[in-house]
């Protein structure tokens, strides 16, 4: 398909950063300032992404390439390209409707982005809380009341320590 | 306005060389392809040689190992370089503008106005 359409089409050839002009007879040319064309061929060129308010720009627009933008600090990104930007947060809270609100009882949120999560369960998996959670950290979870009954120990004792000179036993 | 202005036309002896020029302005020479076409008395004109921006180039069977096309963007300008010249490569020889950057299959978005090239003995 690609060889039938060089063939037939006489603007298949303009290079990236042009386009195929059909006001002076389909020759190349240059893209307009602020405008752009990522792949040869292109019949127009396409306006370049402006980042405007809280974006910002990551990446100038060239002539082959789009603008890249970001977001201002206390933002991030979300969509693909960035193409919204969002409040960021405290660690231990979340983006509600009506702005950051902590992390209720039982839940945490280690990031400035993202909703609370509640805290693990070690109990399910047959453990017992070690460090208790926070609203910014999950809960560690220790060994298994089992592992800690009289005789048993959850740490491999280390080797008796040998004196310089001395053999083994 | 799109100008295309050839030079470097005249008399010269079988065997002999020549070198075309073709002057370009009123666009961006740097990303078009150029062509050389050629038309003797009486005859139809025809594809000699022709160069892309990326500066790939195609020639008519007829003229492959004699005549050479070159470009320098700097100079806005486009070369023929003829050599080994025949009686049948007399013709008045065409600059061309090509439309889309392409040398295959072309076709000419706009013409020069052409020079004479006699190769008599």
């Known amino acids: 398909f690609e060889r039938t359409r060089s063939l037939q089409d006489p603007c298949s050839n303009c290079p990236a950063g042009t386009f195929c002009d059909n006001n002076r007879n389909q020759i190349c040319s240059p893209c307009p300032p602020n405008s752009f064309s990522s792949a040869g061929g292109q019949r127009t060129c396409d306006i370049c992404r402006q980042c405007k308010g809280v974006f910002r720009t990551r990446k100038e627009c060239s002539s082959t390439s789009n603008a890249e933008c970001d977001c201002t600090p206390g933002f991030h990104c979300l969509g693909a390209g960035c193409s919204m930007c969002e409040q960021d947060c405290k660690q231990g809270q979340e983006l509600t409707k009506k702005g950051c609100k902590d992390c209720c009882f039982g839940t945490f949120n280690d990031q400035k982005r993202g909703i609370c999560r509640p805290w693990t369960n070690c109990s399910l998996d047959g453990k017992s809380v070690l460090v208790n959670g926070t609203k910014e950290r999950d809960v560690v979870c220790g060994p298994s009341p089992a592992d800690l009954s009289p005789g048993a120990s959850s740490v491999t004792p280390p080797a008796p320590a040998r004196e310089p000179g001395h053999s083994p036993q | 306005e799109v100008q295309l202005l050839e030079s470097g036309g005249g008399e010269v002896q079988p065997g002999g060389s020549l070198r075309l020029s073709c002057a370009a302005s009123?666009?961006?020479?740097?990303?078009?392809?150029m062509g050389w076409y050629r038309q003797a008395p009486g005859k139809r004109r025809e594809f000699v040689a022709a160069?892309?921006?990326?500066?790939?180039?195609v020639y008519a069977e007829s003229v492959k190992g004699r005549f050479t096309i070159s470009r320098d963007n700097a100079k806005n300008t486009v070369y023929l370089q003829m050599s080994s010249l025949r009686a049948e490569d007399t013709a008045v020889y065409y600059c061309?503008?090509?439309?889309?950057?392409?040398?295959?299959?072309?076709?000419?978005?706009?013409w020069g106005q052409g020079t004479l090239v006699t190769v008599k003995p």
């Open positions: 009123g666009f961006t020479f740097s990303i078009n392809a």
């Open positions: 061309g503008l090509l439309k889309g950057n392409r040398v295959v299959s072309p076709s000419v978005a706009y």
């Open positions: 160069i892309e921006s990326g500066r790939n180039t």
